[in-house]
């Protein structure tokens, strides 16, 4: 907190320029007009003033704005937004894209600050929905944007935004994740044909049911292996040695090589080894000739 | 991470010369204004002079008159030169730009002392 003293003769700022980086904090306190400020927030930007002296800025900033910044000024804030804390932005309305996109540029190369996840927070709830323009601005800064958030969140993304997202968008994004973006996904890409269809829905399938794998392997899609890898357990177990070798196509050979990793080692225990043998790749596991096979699972539900 | 080396500084006699320099690791010059910076021992750190992209030059009233700051954007290199150097001139000299400031991220900065 800077003292309250008198500006000097001649020190009051006629406007906001690099002269002000000479004046000592209290100085720019008491010689400072915060509606000038205020109204010249775009210049600060381009003056090296030193973190100690952007605090007495904010803290005028403050005093004129107790209630939150007016989106005018928000926009103009520059590095000053990194003076800002979370409880500051929870003050603050804003509703312009380029508004957030001037503030993101500010922390642009740094890992997502609590001041921009408040900031990004405040803006969507804002706006209802995460819009395709605001995650495709949201994305470009932050790739890793969409996974952070929570099933709950992703729900109010409408199914025309995810146009808007890329296979590395989804690269840290857990099953729970996938499954509410996957059918979302589905009904956004449903007017492609097949093979453009599939090159768009691929990174979304960690969230496919048993259904759609089935329906994917008619199709000769050649699904590689790292997208297989990360296909729901629960959804490869019911698929059949054919409809594998299917969707694979050649990367079937792949299957080798992760034999004893999830999911394809639950899978092949699922499997007869006639079955398996068919496919010529030496996998073993598979339930042995003439044992029957009880679907328990069946049963249960039956019952 | 812009990285700025800041060297040039040395032990000189009252009203003698040294120009110090100051190098970035990336292209920050040429659309930012450049600062010079001062901290004595036991004292706030105070600017002295600036530069603006465009070239204009502001100086503190201690220093001016005695100092001038210049940058050569091409190689990211701005200077500052510093004539008629006094004892209460000595202090660790640094540069930076606005980022670098507000984020409060600075050089080793280059030791002047002014001493007969």
């Known amino acids: 907190e800077v003292e309250k003293t008198a500006c000097p003769s001649g020190k009051k700022a006629p406007e906001i320029d690099e002269s002000l980086i000479f004046y000592k904090k209290w100085e720019l306190e008491a010689c400072v007009d915060a509606a000038l400020l205020a109204t010249q927030m775009d210049r600060v930007n381009a003056i090296p003033f030193t973190y100690e002296q952007l605090d007495v800025l904010k803290h005028k900033l403050d005093e004129l704005y107790p209630q939150g910044y007016p989106e005018s000024v928000i926009q103009h804030l520059g590095y000053l937004f990194l003076k800002m804390s979370p409880e500051d932005i929870r003050k603050w309305n804003v509703t312009s894209l380029e508004t957030l996109k001037a503030l993101l540029e500010v922390n642009k190369g740094h890992e997502m600050s609590p001041q921009v996840a408040t900031l990004i927070d405040r803006f969507v709830k804002g706006r209802g929905q995460l819009d395709k323009d605001t995650l495709d601005t949201l994305t470009a800064f932050y790739p890793g944007y969409l996974c952070s958030l929570s099933p709950e969140e992703l729900s109010s993304v409408p199914p025309s935004s995810i146009w808007a997202v890329r296979p590395q968008d989804l690269d840290t994004c857990d099953p729970r994740q996938l499954d509410v973006l996957y059918p979302k996904a589905r009904l956004a890409f449903q007017n492609m044909n097949g093979s453009e269809y599939f090159v768009k829905i691929q990174s979304f399938l960690g969230g496919a049911p048993t259904e759609d794998l089935k329906a994917l392997s008619q199709q000769n899609v050649s699904m590689d292996l790292a997208t297989f890898m990360k296909l729901r357990t629960d959804a490869v177990l019911p698929l059949t040695v054919a409809e594998v070798q299917k969707l694979l196509g050649p990367h079937v050979e792949g299957l080798k090589a992760e034999e004893r990793h999830r999911p394809v080692r639950d899978w092949i225990l699922r499997q007869r080894q006639d079955d398996l043998d068919t496919l010529g790749l030496g996998l073993q596991g598979g339930i042995p000739n003439g044992y029957l096979v009880l679907d328990l699972s069946m049963q249960e539900a039956l019952s | 991470q812009v990285q700025l080396v800041e060297s040039g500084g040395g032990l000189v006699q009252p009203g003698g010369s040294l120009r110090l320099s100051c190098a970035a690791s990336?292209?920050?010059?040429?659309?930012?204004?450049v600062a010079w910076y001062r901290q004595a021992p036991g004292k706030e750190r105070e600017a002295v002079a600036v530069?603006?992209?465009?070239?204009?030059?502001k100086y503190a009233d201690s220093v001016k008159g005695r100092f001038t700051i210049s940058r050569y954007n091409a190689k990211n290199i701005a200077y500052l030169q510093m004539n008629s150097l006094k004892p209460e001139d000595t202090a660790v000299y640094y540069c930076?730009?606005?980022?670098?400031?507000?984020?409060?991220?600075w050089g080793q900065g280059t030791q002047v002392t002014v001493s007969s």
């Open positions: 930076n730009t606005a980022r670098g400031a507000a984020v409060d991220s």
């Open positions: 990336g292209s920050i010059f040429s659309g930012n204004a």
């Open positions: 530069i603006t992209r465009d070239g204009d030059t």
